[in-house]
């Protein structure tokens, strides 16, 4: 297993609809044709897997059917979107990238993106 650098933004603010997007960029040392991307959430010293995807270079990401994530790839960049977030989901979201094929296997883990989620205030009753 060889190490690889992964870059991601430090902070992202989710939209009022609970959607957060960020770019995960990896420094590919070779010409990988198969990549796995995993998003991990770290909160209160606990790490959980949020979603994972694989793709063959030049094609779209494939997530599991029930995934809350979507994404696209372009070169060595993966654009990730996480949906359905609420205030309790605020935390550090870490991007993990694995170059699966061809060998050698490379693994890179980003420093994480702190995603802040603010639940929208309910709309006040209108007199109209």
């Amino acid at each position: 297993c060889k190490a690889m650098h992964v870059a991601q933004p430090a902070v992202v603010l989710a939209s009022s609809r609970g959607i957060a997007s960020f770019v995960c960029e990896y420094a590919s040392p070779g010409k990988a044709t198969e990549v796995r991307v995993t998003v991990l959430r770290q909160a209160d010293s606990q790490v959980t897997e949020v979603c994972a995807a694989t793709y063959m270079m030049g094609n779209e990401l494939t997530f599991l059917d029930d995934s809350i994530c979507t994404g696209t790839s372009s070169g060595n960049q993966v654009n990730l979107t996480i949906q359905g977030l609420r205030a309790m989901d605020t935390g550090l979201y870490i991007c993990k990238v694995e170059l699966m094929y061809p060998p050698p296997y490379y693994l890179g883990i980003g420093n994480g993106t702190q995603i802040y989620v603010i639940d929208p205030e309910p709309c006040p009753d209108s007199d109209f």
Partner: nanobody, 115 residues
Framework: QVKLEESGGGLVQPGGSLRLSCVAS????????MGWYRQAPGKQRELVAS???????NHADSVKGRFTISRDNAKNTVYLQMNTLKPEDAAVYYC?????????WGQGTQVTVSS
């Protein structure tokens, strides 16, 4: 475990056509990508084309306009239509299954392009 069975390889003259098929069976995930790789003697295995469950495709520059990948999700089968074959297309063609949970290779089918 997923089993991949390729067929359709053979000997063809330059300029000719072949259609490769790959049937996936076993514990198949709901969403996955299928691809075709090829490996000529003494060379590294290279990605020729890939297709996702939703039908999104990608073809290597060297085969664009000549090869077309397609799939029949109901039959868990992926096809590679190869037209205007050249001697440099000769190789063992491998089917590839890639999902979030697993990845598998087929045993390969030989394509020979010679007059």
């Amino acid at each position: 475990q997923v089993k991949l069975e390729e067929s359709g390889g053979g000997l063809v003259q330059p300029g000719g056509s072949l259609r490769l098929s790959c049937v996936a069976s076993g514990s198949i995930d709901s969403t996955y990508t299928m691809g075709w790789y090829r490996q000529a003697p003494g060379k590294q295995r290279e990605l020729v084309a890939s297709i996702t469950s939703s039908g999104s495709t990608n073809h290597a520059d060297s085969v664009k306009g000549r090869f077309t990948i397609s799939r029949d999700n109901a039959k868990n089968t992926v096809y590679l239509q190869m037209n205007t074959l050249k001697p440099e297309d000769a190789a063992v063609y491998y089917c590839r299954y890639l999902s979030v949970l697993s990845a598998y290779w087929g045993q390969g089918t030989q394509v020979t392009v010679s007059s």
